[in-house]
């Protein structure tokens, strides 16, 4: 049967590990609701959506964000929530729809001609609002990357790793978000144990380069837990 | 529109590693799910593991955990296949496949809108 196919064929719906940290199960994520399956001629609806534990943004689809399903609820629990339409209130970038950003606690839209000059002041302004800003200003697909007309160099603002030049990644430095390099093998890396302590970082690094993963340097396996040095390693 | 390439493919021994990359053309690629699957002969096509848009989760079939690592760089257009400790048993076509990554929840193989060629892999005992 079509079910049968489906679950056999289905990503298991896995928790997310802590941190979020690639490598590890999870699920990968998915198209809307509507289905266009081969050799039919109409759309067919899986409902198959429930909420999503997350402990990032960039564990979510591109149309969501991660917070508390509830205000002022359990920060401990967050899941994956659909994203802000414009207008609506929103607290960081993320909150809102692609196509827009978050500007004095509204979702307002990604306007070409004046987001760029705007960047700065908005992620200014909004670290002032809520704490909650702290967890990330990215939104994945909010400004198409022809919005920049080239990639950011080290030290540019950004919003997202795609603004940034090959070699660079989008992360926080103080209330902003500059482009840094990417993590060569050898170097101190951030492996997040603590389900959202990635929020905390106000320095923060990027992921390690490809082919290499964040792991406990061999000679500090006999260290007390939070001595623990992880550096890139091969994998 | 997203065109998938798969590269990287080839004959080696039980034991070795092999990495596979699949390049694509389209500006959709960096919000897609990437994922990689397989085709023996004479068998259905199976999953191998998947990667979210931001290469924040990923997923693995339990044959493949411990021994093969997804990856994509999305400022490349690459996603990538790093396959150690290769069986006889992976022995298959692989070929990439994404689709829309919109919200968080189950995706099956059919919501993978688009697909590669493939590439062979055969791995001799």
């Known amino acids: 049967t079509l079910n049968s196919v489906l679950n056999s064929n289905a990503i298991k719906n896995l928790p997310p590990p802590l941190g979020g940290a690639a490598g590890h199960p999870g699920s990968a994520v998915s198209a809307a609701p509507g289905i266009l399956y081969p050799g039919g001629n109409k759309y067919q609806t899986i409902d198959n959506y429930q909420p999503y534990p997350c402990a990032e943004d960039e564990e979510c689809g591109t149309d969501e964000y991660c917070a508390s399903p509830t205000r002022g609820g359990d920060a401990g629990v967050q899941i994956c929530l659909a994203c802000r339409k414009r207008r609506k209130r929103c607290m960081r970038h993320a909150m809102c729809c692609p196509g827009n950003y978050c500007k004095n606690g509204i979702c307002v839209s990604s306007d070409q001609n004046h987001f760029r000059g705007e960047i700065e002041e908005t992620i200014t302004e909004s670290f002032g609002n809520d704490h909650s800003t702290l967890d990330g200003y990215s939104r994945r697909t909010t400004l198409s990357s022809k919005m920049y007309h080239t990639k950011g160099q080290e030290g540019s603002v950004c919003l997202r790793s795609s603004d940034c030049a090959s070699g660079l990644c989008c992360a926080r430095h103080f209330w902003s978000k500059i482009c840094k390099p990417v993590l060569k093998e050898g170097q101190v890396c951030t492996k997040h144990r603590r389900k959202g302590s990635h929020g905390l970082e106000i320095f923060q690094r990027c992921y390690c380069g490809e082919g290499l993963s964040c792991r406990i340097q061999k000679d500090h396996h006999q260290a007390s837990n939070s001595s623990r040095l992880h550096t890139c390693q091969r994998h | 529109e997203v065109q998938l390439v798969e590269s990287g493919g080839g004959l080696v021994q039980a034991g070795d590693s092999l990495r596979l990359s699949c390049t694509a053309s389209g500006s959709a690629f960096s919000s897609s799910v990437v994922g990689w699957f397989r085709q023996a002969p004479g068998k259905e096509r199976e999953f191998v593991t998947a990667?979210?848009?931001?290469?924040?989760?990923?997923d693995y079939a339990d044959s493949v955990k411990g021994r093969f690592t997804i990856s994509r760089d999305n400022a490349k257009n690459t996603a990538y296949l790093q396959m150690n400790s290769l069986k006889p048993e992976d022995t298959a076509v692989y070929y990439c496949?994404?689709?829309?990554?919109?919200?968080?929840?189950?995706?099956?193989?059919?919501?993978?809108?688009?697909w590669g060629q493939g590439t062979q892999v055969t791995v001799s005992s």
């Open positions: 990667i979210n848009w931001s290469g924040a989760r990923t």
């Open positions: 496949a994404a689709g829309s990554d919109r919200y968080a929840r189950v995706l099956t193989e059919y919501e993978y809108v688009w």
